[in-house]
């Protein structure tokens, strides 16, 4: 069966605030949960939403979220069907409304000694207290002449005089918080002598150097006086003008005319009407000087044929908002249409080529105008000017295919070399206007290359196959000078390659053949039992039909490998006393003899006085020193090989002879000469 | 024990309207929600919706909004799927489910001109 | 819509022998509550189709212990350990994770 392990329950909600319907649920088969608000499926929206499955609400509406939610939970598996408890929001809310004339019907039946009764139209849950307010100052209840009812949320006047005229508005607060009116009612019943606007000053924006006219107009039986202060509450006649004011004059209809206005003429102006009685009236209005700042640059465009993109032309910061329009090619946006200005927004839709150009956004008010161009580039997808084809390179040498499109904005090209993106290096270059050149082409360049050409707009991209053209080339060439050893067999192998596959022969450079225990099987000389009269130059050739024949010369010499005589063995030397490392080589050429210590070759003409190597190549070390233990290695090498042999060298203290020891006593070392390295 | 008795065959003409029943027994009719499930012939299962037999709130297959209605009648514990301007595509066994343990033997529709 | 997927349309199986029928699903079926909404059913030719598996591995009431069900987020086995021969009929895997229900396009267990 279903189980309700959390059921959702009626809470307190304030209204634009979040709040959470818990349902958590257990059942043994596929659990489907969904929410009813009286009885009806509730649907996810951005405001209301399942949130698993519980119910969650991003800010409770007070209409759409009155009445009663069930948390359903159904089981696919038996079709069972849970309905959790009901539950429901006691919202609290509050709403600003209008205060209005209740009575009498209309303004026009207000008369002096009537009754007037004002009704405040906020509302809210729970019920709001009400406070009332005449031209900003609080009405507290049990004041002369009126009476508040909270109830009714009506203020009573009775009977009203002048004295009640004024702005009446009220606010309201309750635990949910507080609202004041939104439109508030002005009471005005005439008492002739009291001063009354018959045209208050507005607030003006004026460019430099130009003029600002202010209208204020009283009107009081007897007529009011009418008095202009500016910010400082200097006062502005037409005798007395402060001296920033010099260009200031005050009309006998009260009007103020400022001319040539400048910065420090900025300001508040006050125009004060006085009645015989009642309270001074005093009207407030600015005098801005108009301003307007440069427009932030444009980044170019770069925008694809078929698309819709829109450019934001931001206003400069100015006084008054400055209008904005755009132009293109000198001629103003409309305001709908394919291309059209919308709110500060140029937009394009379904672009095309032709769209492609500077667009202009304007801007100005009183101050001036600011201007500011936005290039815009229509991107074309490339196309094909010249392909890359199927080519044959010639191996070695520069190698050219070409990719030329062309679109706007110039297109980008990249190449490929199977499937692998070719990243410019010492070999590969690729030419601004495409073209892929390869420096110096190797066999395996022959392969598929791709080229891919793109705009923003999109790509094309085409393949050719390169076939390489080999070189007629010995595959490797033969090292000029070799060396057969004496008296053993030997071969001295030629390879080559080419567009056709070369055959290959060799002979003696004085062109005497070869003799009969010498073969030339496809390229490799073979010496069955070398002879010194093998001894000589010889020539490989390597030729072809369409590629004709090239040549190679080697000198083979013919030697005795070395082999060592004598090898130095492993030596135990006493300190200060001398050590004789023996070393004698045989071979033919004649080995020469070099020596290494400690992993450095012993320079014969570097080696100080206490080292010396002998003609027959014996290495002497005199007077050695611990430093000097260590493996010696003699190497023996000619012109056609390289042998060596190595031995540690000891060097250890002499001992102190103990009184104990005769005269005839055994040393406790020997010199010890023993077995030896040996190295080929 | 539970059973879901469906009405019989039916044959209709292309645009006209077809409307099936299910009577159940054997448990609480509004405990239980109800599927329908169709199969066209030689083809697999395919969902219609489901209707919670309490409240008679219903959950149809997009594929057939504006063309199907789910209905109950609590007095007789019986479901109704009306399905209107029948196709040929429409011939199939109509299936009524229970969950989906518990299925009606189903009702061949055949749209036909 | 989450679109299930049944790769064999048939599958002959020798009686006694082990028979798998795999399912896969576009979206993970595993819902919060850590549950993989799949139904396994069969239908039998000429009868209604029986729910044999649901949440993956649950066996439903009445069904041999032979029916096993396994499988991940997204890829789903029906297991038969000795195949009978009142098993042959068309099987159905079936998600419950969103609207629409959806069912895969069923697999045939037919005997050799």
């Known amino acids: 069966a279903i189980v309700f392990i959390k059921q959702p329950s009626s809470q307190d909600a304030l209204q634009g605030r979040r709040a959470l319907l818990r349902c958590e649920v257990e059942a043994p088969g596929p659990v489907h949960v969904y929410w009813l608000l009286d009885g009806a499926p509730v649907q996810d929206t951005e405001r209301r939403f399942a949130q698993g499955s519980s119910l969650s609400f991003a800010a409770v509406d007070r209409l759409q979220d009155s009445g009663t939610f069930q948390c359903v939970a159904r089981d696919d598996v038996t079709g069972e069907e849970a309905r959790s408890a009901n539950a429901s929001f006691n919202i609290k809310w509050i709403e600003a409304g209008p205060v209005v004339l209740k009575h009498p019907a209309s303004e026009a039946e207000i008369q002096p000694q009537t009754q007037v009764t004002l009704r405040c139209h906020i509302d809210g849950h729970p019920r709001p207290t009400y406070q009332w307010f005449r031209d900003g100052t609080p009405l507290s209840d049990g004041q002369s002449n009126h009476t508040v009812s909270s109830k009714e949320r009506n203020l009573t006047l009775r009977p009203a005089g002048p004295e009640h005229s004024g702005l009446y508005s009220c606010c309201a607060h309750s635990a949910f918080g507080q609202a004041c009116s939104s439109q508030n009612f002005t009471l005005s019943i005439a008492d002739e002598s009291f001063a009354r606007v018959v045209l208050a000053p507005q607030d003006v924006v004026v460019a430099r150097y130009e003029e600002a006219m202010f209208h204020c107009q009283f009107s009081a039986q007897p007529p009011p006086s009418l008095q202009w202060l500016f910010e400082d509450e200097t006062p502005i006649t037409n005798r007395s003008r402060p001296p920033h004011l010099r260009r200031a004059t005050v009309f006998a209809n009260g009007s103020l005319l400022l001319t040539q206005v400048r910065p420090r003429n900025a300001g508040i102006y006050r125009c004060i009407g006085q009645g015989q009685r009642g309270p001074p009236i005093i009207l407030e209005a600015t005098l801005h000087l108009a301003e307007i700042e440069d427009m932030p640059l444009f980044e170019p465009r770069v925008f694809t044929a078929g698309s819709e993109e829109r450019v934001t032309c931001l206003p400069p910061k100015g006084l008054p908002e400055p209008s904005v329009w755009w132009e293109h090619a000198g001629v103003r946006l409309p305001t709908h249409g394919r291309v059209y200005q919308k709110g500060h927004e140029l937009v394009l839709a379904n672009i095309a080529e032709s769209d492609a150009g500077v667009y202009t956004c304007h801007a100005a008010n009183l101050a001036g105008q600011r201007r500011q161009d936005v290039n815009i580039t229509v991107a074309t997808v490339p196309s094909w000017l010249k392909k890359p084809q199927d080519s044959q390179l010639e191996e070695g040498k520069p190698g050219y295919l070409d990719c030329l499109t062309q679109a706007t904005p110039k297109p980008t090209v990249v190449w490929y070399r199977n499937q692998m993106l070719i990243s410019e290096d010492s070999r590969f270059e690729v030419f601004k206007n495409g073209t892929l050149r390869i420096n110096s082409v190797e066999v395996y360049d022959g392969t598929w290359y791709r080229c891919m050409s793109s705009t923003p707009a999109g790509s094309i991209e085409a393949q050719a196959r390169v076939q390489v053209l080999e070189k007629l080339k010995f595959t490797p060439p033969p090292q000029p000078q070799q060396c057969m050893e004496f008296d053993k067999e030997a071969t001295v192998p030629c390879s080559a390659t080419g567009r056709e596959k070369p055959t290959i022969k060799w002979e003696r450079a004085d062109g005497s053949s070869l003799p009969e225990w010498v073969t030339d099987n496809a390229g490799t000389l073979h010496f069955a039992r070398v002879t010194r009269d093998d001894a000589g130059n010889y020539t490989c050739i390597a030729s072809n039909g369409p590629q004709g024949q090239i040549r190679a010369h080697v000198q083979l010499t013919v030697a005795v490998f070395i082999t060592f005589k004598v090898e130095p063995e492993r030596t135990t030397v006493y300190q200060g006393h001398t050590a004789l490392l023996q070393c004698e080589a045989q071979g033919d050429p004649k080995p020469l003899i070099q020596w290494k210590g400690k992993d450095r070759i012993l320079d014969p003409t570097k080696l100080g006085p206490r080292m010396h190597i002998f003609q027959n190549g014996s290495l002497v070390i005199h007077d050695v020193a611990p430093e000097d233990s260590g493996r010696y290695t003699c190497i023996a090498g000619n012109s056609c090989n390289i042998k060596h042999t190595e031995a540690p060298l000891y060097v250890v203290d002499k001992p102190v002879p103990e009184e104990s020891e005769g005269p005839g006593s055994p040393p406790p070392y020997k010199m010890i000469q023993t077995h030896h390295h040996h190295h080929h | 024990q539970v059973q879901l008795v469906q009405s019989g065959a039916e044959v209709k003409r292309p645009g006209a309207s077809v409307k099936v029943s299910c009577k159940t027994s054997?448990?609480?009719?509004?405990?239980?929600?109800m599927h329908w499930v169709r199969q066209a012939p030689g083809k697999g299962l395919e969902w219609i919706g489901v209707i919670s037999t309490y409240y008679g709130n219903v959950s149809y297959n997009q594929k057939f909004k504006g063309r199907v209605t789910m209905t109950r009648d609590t007095s007789t514990s019986t479901v109704y799927m009306e399905l209107s301007s029948l196709t040929s595509e429409d011939t199939a066994i109509y299936y009524c489910?229970?969950?989906?343990?518990?299925w009606g033997q189903g009702t061949l529709v055949t749209v036909s001109s | 819509d989450i679109v299930i997927t049944q790769t064999e349309l048939s599958l002959p199986v020798t009686p006694g022998e082990r028979a798998s029928i795999s399912c896969r699903s576009s979206?993970?079926?595993?819902?919060?509550?850590?549950?993989?909404?799949l139904n396994w059913f069969l239908q039998k030719p000429g009868q209604s189709p029986q729910l044999l598996i649901y949440l993956m591995s649950t066996r439903a009431s009445g069904v041999s212990d032979r029916f096993s069900g396994s499988g991940s987020g997204t890829d789903f086995t029906l297991k038969i350990s000795r195949v009978e021969a009142e098993d042959v009929g068309v099987y159905y895997c079936q998600q419950l994770v969103e609207y629409p229900f959806t069912f895969g396009q069923g697999t045939k267990l037919e005997i050799k």
């Open positions: 054997g448990y609480t009719f509004t405990d239980y929600a």
């Open positions: 489910a229970r969950g989906f343990a518990y």
């Open positions: 979206k993970s079926l595993q819902k919060k509550d850590g549950k993989t909404y």
